[in-house]
């Protein structure tokens, strides 16, 4: 019997408090042998693949999710699956991307840097909105 | 609407070998697994493979490695499997089918079928 | 390879019976992460390709009459119909949709008296 999915995480760099116009990287990380990382935003209702996955460990590989210019419409909730054939994995837990305005002042920092509590997250739910296949600002990094 | 297309009958020689068509129409066909069955009366129904369009990964059963090869040709929307080594035991009705749990998570199974091609091979 | 077992092999009912028909794999279909049965049942009409009836083990598809019901988890499910009709008379098989290679039940034939 093979194992069940390991869930899958998410993180973003460099931070998850974004000024606007910068740019922001969500990391989307499950077992060897996926196929397809889908970067989830607001639930299902809006969605990007990529099929260019790369070996993060000899245990791990990840997939990156680039949004170059950070707009006030791409705050919100993100969250990560898999598709390891022939099955897709549990989402992720979810993470809240936040979008501030560039403040400049030498006392704060233009992002939020990961901290050892990681980003922050909500439990994924459990509903199943209809999807649309769009990716509305969502493009692959690609890393080669 | 949503077909899968299919020659209907193939006749080949022994030792040959065959390549059957399925011409995806009306869905977005790098979206969704396409698959391959095979039916005859004293097997039943039996899964060969599953080529996913965008990537050209394939996925085969054991027993049909080295027999059946699956590619797909995203420009024409069509999926191909081509049978070498040709025996009298291959003569079967070969199905592909649109797997949709790719698109979509919360569904699993075909969900569209193609006619069905009749291979016959005889000398 | 998951093993799919059907039973009976055959029934012969009348039209408006209820009639239900068994599945067992031989290792579980439900995938813990998300709860999904990956458990697929088919319906096949004489010269006609299978059609999709149910799939998640108890979702209708699509256009798919509510007399035709799927339950189950994990190794052992069943279809019911509820009532059966004249057009219903087919062979019905179950799928593993868990894991590769994907397999089938040898299927059940429903023949109306």
């Known amino acids: 019997q093979e194992e069940d999915l390991p869930r899958p995480s998410i993180s973003a760099e460099p931070g998850t408090v974004i000024p606007l116009g910068s740019h922001v990287t969500f990391v989307c990380r499950g077992p060897v042998g996926v196929q397809t990382f889908r970067l989830e935003r607001d639930s299902r209702s809006t969605y990007n693949d990529t099929e260019d996955v790369s070996q993060a460990s000899p245990s791990e590989s990840e997939a990156r999710f680039r949004i170059d210019s950070v707009r006030e419409g791409n705050a919100g909730l993100y969250r990560c699956i898999y598709y390891k054939p022939p099955k897709w994995s549990e989402q992720s837990d979810y993470l809240e991307l936040l979008v501030k305005e560039s403040s400049g002042g030498p006392d704060s920092p233009d992002t939020e840097p990961g901290s050892s509590a990681g980003p922050t997250q909500r439990p994924s739910d459990n509903s199943h909105n209809e999807h649309a296949p769009a990716s509305q600002g969502l493009k692959a990094e690609h890393l080669y | 609407q949503i077909q899968l297309q299919q020659s209907g009958a193939e006749l080949a020689r022994p030792g040959a070998s065959v390549k059957l068509p399925c011409k995806a129409s009306d869905y977005i066909f790098i979206s969704y697994g396409l698959n391959w069955v095979r039916q005859t009366t004293g097997q039943g129904l039996e899964w060969i493979g599953e080529i996913y369009p965008r990537s050209g990964h394939t996925y085969y059963n054991e027993k049909f490695k080295g027999k059946a090869t699956l590619t797909a040709d995203k420009s024409s929307s069509t999926a191909y499997m081509e049978l070498r080594s040709l025996t009298s035991e291959d003569s079967a009705v070969y199905f592909c089918?649109?797997?949709?749990?790719?698109?979509?998570?919360?569904?699993?199974?075909?969900?569209?079928w193609g006619q069905g091609t009749t291979l016959t091979v005889s000398s | 390879d998951i093993v799919m077992k059907q039973s009976p092999s055959s029934l012969r009912v009348s039209a408006g019976e209820k009639v239900t028909m068994s599945c067992k794999s031989s290792?579980?279909?439900?995938?813990?992460?998300?709860?999904?049965?990956?458990l697929a049942w088919y319906q096949q009409k004489p010269g006609q390709p299978p059609k999709l009836l149910i799939y998640?083990?108890?979702t209708r598809e699509s256009g798919v009459p509510d007399r035709f019901t799927g339950s189950g988890s994990g190794t052992d499910f069943a279809l019911t119909i509820s009532s059966v009709q004249a057009e219903d008379l087919a062979v019905y098989y179950c799928q593993n949709d868990h894991s590769y290679p994907f397999t089938f039940g040898s299927g059940t034939k429903l023949e109306i008296k």
């Open positions: 998640g083990a108890s």
């Open positions: 290792q579980s279909l439900l995938n813990s992460g998300n709860q999904k049965n990956y």
């Open positions: 089918a649109r797997r949709s749990v790719f698109y979509d998570y919360d569904k699993n199974g075909f969900d569209y």
